[in-house]
């Protein structure tokens, strides 16, 4: 069964890991995420108002996928960002970003995904978020749009 | 040399890992994979009829890339899914999915990839598979189409 | 702060990890990378003339993203490769590759990313590089174009 992790048997401490899935009642940025039901994982990391909150400094692999789609293509520029916020720093730091322009044929029904994933050195109290340019074009199915990380 | 892993020296137990590459004699779903030759890895996980079989419960990062291409674009909807099957459950569970519609200009030679990757809590005896919507549009080069996982 | 890693506290040895970001003064192949400033990580792995040099045999997750864009689409075929070179072998080995053809509307401003990531068994002295087909179409922003790995 895919669900909340039991601690892997060979480990004493809990593995720090998260896999959050799309939540269709996102109304504004940053995106909000399902943190309880379905194929969600949340262990050793907190979820707060759209953000994953790091509670232990170290190296993390961070990833996100967003599924954009629309009824009638007008090639609105799309962007998908994973960014970091920390009360010590005045500005958000964009960690990873994907952009798309001129990606479909005008007037047609269209669909496209953006995937991001990389390693970062994160500090306790860092908050990680996902931002998209066009909320109305995001499909929030749990298999299609997600956000996660794990501590190396 | 890239090939089957020797146990990493600092570990006693064998790392659970797989990297399978495209196999062009796939005739139906799920996709079949090369599990022996080339840059393939298979250690602590079994391969059976297109599926990776988990033999130890725990957290896994699972990924797949599929390379779609065609001689003449007709914008057939493309889908790429990683799904899980377990004898305890009646239905397949779609873990990750990518879809594409209206992605090329009618009549042109075209090429596009779909990449998926995320963390899941998997249970011993889970079987993981990859499905695509249009088998004839997949190119199975080992560097282009692959399926893998590793235990965190 | 995102920067060079301190050794994760529960580990004695340094984690082997790299995250390099786009460097706009790349003039030829392979791509060159920023290895010092910004959200860069380089620990237990060397950077030399565009390549990541492995100094310990084992299993690594290797990833790269490249952001292509242009002022006026002419659908030049795009390719993005991660390849390996070792003095013991005469030829480069392409580990992962993404290709795009017919991806934008002729004459329009366009933008598209390619993401690659997978697990490989690497040997001490392997050199890993990234190649693209059209250097002039790459945008080197640190959040958009990057290359990294970590030892499992």
């Amino acid at each position: 069964q895919i669900g909340h992790p039991s601690p892997p048997p060979e480990k004493k401490e809990l593995r720090k890991v998260a896999h959050l899935t799309g939540k269709s009642n996102s109304r504004s940025m940053p995106l909000e995420w399902e943190d309880t039901y379905g194929i969600v994982l949340l262990s050793g990391v907190k979820y707060k108002k759209g953000g994953l909150v790091i509670n232990e400094t170290g190296l993390y692999f961070v990833y996100s996928k967003v599924y954009f789609r629309g009824q009638s293509c007008n090639n609105l520029p799309l962007s998908h960002k994973v960014y970091m916020r920390n009360s010590k720093y005045p500005q958000d730091l964009v960690m990873m970003e994907g952009k798309m322009m001129s990606y479909c044929t005008t007037g047609q029904m269209w669909a496209r995904s953006s995937y991001l994933g990389a390693v970062f050195n994160l500090t306790s109290a860092d908050h990680l978020y996902v931002n998209v340019s066009e909320l109305s074009l995001v499909n929030f199915e749990e298999s299609q749009t997600f956000f996660g990380l794990y501590k190396l | 040399q890239i090939g089957h892993p020797s146990p990493p020296p600092e570990k006693k137990e064998l790392r659970k890992v797989a990297h399978l590459t495209g196999k062009s004699n796939s005739r139906s779903m799920p996709l079949e994979w090369e599990d022996t030759y080339g840059i393939v890895l298979l250690s602590g996980v079994k391969y059976k009829k297109g599926g990776l079989v988990i033999n130890e419960t725990g957290l896994y990062f699972v990924y797949s890339k599929v390379y779609f291409r065609g001689q003449s674009c007709n914008n057939l909807p493309l889908s790429h899914k990683v799904y899980m099957r377990n004898s305890k459950y009646p239905q397949d569970l779609v873990m990750m999915e990518g879809k594409m519609m209206s992605y090329c200009t009618t009549g042109q030679m075209w090429a596009r990839s779909s990449y998926l990757g995320a963390v899941f809590n998997l249970t011993s005896a889970d079987h993981l598979y990859v499905n695509v919507s249009e088998l004839s549009l997949v190119n199975f080069e080992e560097s282009q189409t692959f399926f893998g996982l590793y235990k965190l | 702060q995102i920067g060079h890693p301190s050794p994760p506290p529960e580990k004695k040895e340094l984690r082997k990890v790299a995250h390099l970001t786009g460097k706009s003064n790349s003039r030829s192949m392979p791509l060159e990378w920023e290895d010092t400033y910004g959200i860069v990580l380089l620990s237990g792995v060397k950077y030399k003339k565009g390549g990541l040099v492995i100094n310990e045999t084992g299993l690594y997750f290797v990833y790269s993203k490249v952001y292509f864009r242009g002022q006026s689409c002419n659908n030049l075929p795009l390719s993005h490769k991660v390849y390996m070179r070792n003095s013991k072998y005469p030829q480069d080995l392409v580990m992962m590759e993404g290709k795009m053809m017919s991806y934008c509307t002729t004459g329009q401003m366009w933008a598209r990313s390619s993401y690659l990531g997978a697990v490989f068994n690497l040997t001490s002295a392997d050199h890993l590089y990234v190649n693209v087909s059209e250097l002039s179409l790459v945008n080197f922003e640190e959040s958009q174009t990057f290359f990294g790995l970590y030892k499992l």
């Epitope: - | 001689q71 003449s72 009618t106 009549g107 042109q108 030679m109 090429a111 190119n139 | 002419n74 017919s102």
Partner: antibody, heavy 119, light 106 residues
Framework: QVQLVESGGGVVQPGRSLRLSCAAS????????IHWVRQAPGKGLEWVAV????????FYADSVKGRFTISRDNSKNTLYLQMNSLRAEDTAVYYC????????????WGQGTLVTVSS | DIQMTQSPSTLSASVGDRVTITCRAS??????LAWYQQKPGKAPKFLIY???SLESGVPSRFSGSGSGTEFTLTISSLQPDDFATYYC????????FGQGTRLEIK
């Protein structure tokens, strides 16, 4: 100027094999898809096969699938067509033709080479 | 497969005439149509793409029009060099040629 020159045609018995070549010059061969198109005596044009600029993908007409193999050597600026299990209906002039911008039409053609399959 | 049908199969005309060749597709091919000219014993020569775009170096007396399923190639004033066989080719879905139209001297 762009030039495509076919060779390797001739008379062959049914069931036998033949390999055609097409030597390219006057353009950057490795950046273009190349096709084979044939024309039976006194008949119209029939598309046979295409190979992509880097040789990674190949597509064939149903009439030759499984019997013909298209390949290329970009270091030699040469295209090939390996024809196996030849039939009388494969008798034709075979042209190599350069693809225009991955669009499946042909801006330059070779002069052709005649293949006759006869017992 | 998309079928391409040219008409007429043979056309007799004189130097200076305006001539039109028609090509019909069995289903809509938008504007994805090319025209070629072929002389006996020679390779085809590329004339027009995307139904109406003239290839560089092709005389302006040649023009193409149409979209969907009906297309025409027009030669505004026939020259001696224009007597040849003309083929249309669709590239909307794979590749198919028309059967050809032979343009002969009347």
């Amino acid at each position: 100027q762009v030039q495509l020159v076919e060779s390797g045609g001739g008379v062959v018995q049914p069931g036998r094999s033949l390999r055609l070549s097409c030597a390219a010059s006057g353009f950057t061969f490795s950046t273009y898809g190349i096709h084979w198109v044939r024309q039976a005596p006194g008949k119209g044009l029939e598309w046979v096969a295409v190979i992509w600029y880097d040789g990674s993908d190949k597509f064939y007409a149903d009439s030759v699938k499984g019997r013909f193999t298209i390949s290329r050597d970009n270091s030699k600026n040469t295209l090939y067509l390996q024809m196996n299990s030849l039939r009388a209906e494969d008798t034709a002039v075979y042209y190599c033709a350069r693809d225009r911008d991955n669009w499946n039409y042909f801006d330059y053609w070779g002069q052709g080479t005649l293949v006759t399959v006869s017992s | 497969d998309i079928q391409m049908t040219q008409s007429p199969s043979t056309l007799s005309a004189s130097v200076g005439d305006r001539v039109t060749i028609t090509c019909r597709a069995s289903q809509s091919i938008s504007s994805w149509l090319a025209w070629y000219q072929q002389k006996p014993g020679k390779a085809p020569k590329f004339l027009i793409y995307q139904a109406s775009s003239l290839e560089s170096g092709v005389p302006s007396r040649f023009s193409g029009s149409g979209s969907g399923t009906e297309f025409t190639l027009t030669i505004s004033s026939l020259q001696p060099d224009d007597f040849a066989t003309y083929y249309c080719q669709q590239y909307n879905s794979y590749i198919t040629f028309g059967q050809g139209t032979r343009l002969e001297i009347k």
